[in-house]
Interface confidence: low
């Protein structure tokens, strides 16, 4: 007869292992006991358990409750055992020696690994702004045995560097992202996807991008000068800009306070009937908490009556 | 078999506290993440929060960053979920669940559920 096992039994973290160790024997020949031991090279050999075919399953103190046979029906020729919620310590190399009748003894050796699969960490970096030149988005960290792939699955344009520390039974790997921060990144996903064969599907992280910036301000409502002319209603100046975070928005005038009357709403300047005391250099303040814009404007209020007043018929004189 | 059993919930006045429990049985749990999940009427099942098998790393989701503490006691195969500051949208009937190997959803144990009621 023969022994049949596998070279190498692998099982996830916490799963339970199941040691395979099946005689093949002749006709007539029956299995009288099978000894499980540890073999770890350099280390004298640990017994497991004793499967004796009239008293049954002995297992060894050191492995109290964690050493049964599987579940019935049982074939008498079939040594496996199964190993409890496997743990790192767990991995290592085993030996069954078969006892039969009349053939004699056989023996086979199997290694036992242990998978951990990582429980990955993603901890973004610093404040992105945009102006940055290339900073660090976010690191991803995950540990296990053996070591994790650590990628990155994203739109945005970026580099990465990977770095991987070595544990006695495991392997920590980080990966960073830098990228160049622009307006454009706001509101994109940045993945970290870490893969393992310990993992049914790989694990992902996701982190949002925030990019702090304060575009260039500008003010529209004064794009056709004729209509600021006495008298106009509803005249208003819009101060226009955009930021992360949304910015805040403030009116002044240049060369006095605003009149009475002019209405300020947020990004906007409201004017009551124009007159010549609307005339002045206004400008709008725009703020957050990355950088500040100022933009100003020109206001010309035109008096019609003035302005038929001064035109003049040109008569040519010889 | 593994078998997850809730109890604590309840009817609580917003701003108050609740202790949930989950005992379970039929398998030590403490190489195994566990978590908890909550449903109110009408929405999907949402995960709360979750902790490692050996209780060092926890996770919670945004709306609950705070207020809600998981621990584990693996000694008496229990987990715990510390609801403080409760408030009404917290309303939901709460489950625990055990992630066998700490893998991808899917490889889940469920208990049934306890009702936890946020009103004045």
């Known amino acids: 007869g023969e022994l049949e096992t596998s070279d190498v039994v692998t099982v996830v973290l916490g799963q339970d292992a199941k040691l395979p160790c099946f005689y093949r024997g002749d006709s007539g020949e029956q299995v009288g006991q099978v000894a499980w031991a540890r073999v770890d090279a350099g280390e004298g050999a640990q017994e497991l358990a004793l499967l004796h075919s009239k008293y049954g399953l002995h297992v060894s103190p050191a492995y109290e409750g964690r050493v049964e046979q599987p579940p019935p029906p049982r074939n008498p020729l079939d040594g496996s055992v199964l190993l409890r919620n496997a743990v790192q310590a767990d991995e290592g190399e085993y030996e069954c020696r078969v006892s039969t009748f009349p053939a004699g003894s056989f023996q086979a050796r199997l290694r036992l690994r242990v998978l951990v699969p990582p429980l990955p960490s993603l901890n973004p970096g610093p404040a992105l702004e945009e102006g940055q030149g290339l900073t660090l988005a976010a690191s991803c960290t995950a540990e296990g045995s053996p070591a994790p792939s650590v990628t990155w699955d994203t739109e945005v344009k970026g580099t990465t560097s990977s770095r991987s520390f070595k544990h006695s039974r495991s392997a920590a790997v980080t990966s960073e992202f830098h990228l160049v921060p622009s307006r454009s990144m706001n509101g994109q996903p940045l993945t970290c996807v870490v893969s393992h064969p310990g993992l049914l599907q790989d694990q992902r992280i996701t982190h949002i991008l925030h990019v702090s910036f304060l575009a260039e301000a500008s003010v529209r409502g004064l794009e056709d000068q004729n209509l600021w002319h006495i008298g106009r209603e509803g005249a208003m100046l819009k101060c226009l800009s955009e930021g992360q975070p949304p910015p805040s928005y403030n009116w002044t005038r240049l060369d006095g306070p605003l009149p009475s009357g002019v209405r300020v709403d947020g990004d906007t300047l409201g004017f009551p009937p124009l007159t010549t005391e609307h005339s002045g250099i206004y400008v709008c303040h725009v703020s957050n908490e990355f950088s500040s814009r100022d933009s100003q404007v020109t206001v010309d209020v035109l008096d019609p009556q003035e302005d038929s007043g001064k035109q003049v018929d040109l008569v040519s004189a010889s | 078999e593994v078998q997850l059993l809730e109890s604590g919930g309840g009817l609580v006045q917003p701003g108050g506290s609740l202790r949930l429990s989950c005992a379970a049985s039929?398998?030590?749990?403490?190489?195994?993440?566990m978590g908890w999940y909550r449903q109110a009427p009408g929405k999907e099942r949402e995960l709360v929060s979750s902790?490692?098998?050996?209780?060092?790393?926890?996770r919670y989701a945004d709306s609950v960053k705070g207020r809600f503490t998981i621990s584990r006691d693996n000694s008496k195969n229990t987990l715990y979920l510390q609801m403080n500051s409760l408030k009404p949208e917290d309303t939901a009937v709460y489950y625990c669940?055990?992630?066998?190997?700490?893998?991808?959803?899917?490889?889940?144990?469920w208990g049934q559920g306890t009702q936890v009621t946020v009103s004045s």
């Open positions: 902790i490692s098998g050996s209780g060092g790393s926890t």
């Open positions: 039929g398998r030590t749990l403490s190489s195994y993440a």
């Open positions: 669940a055990v992630y066998i190997l700490e893998l991808a959803p899917g490889a889940e144990y």
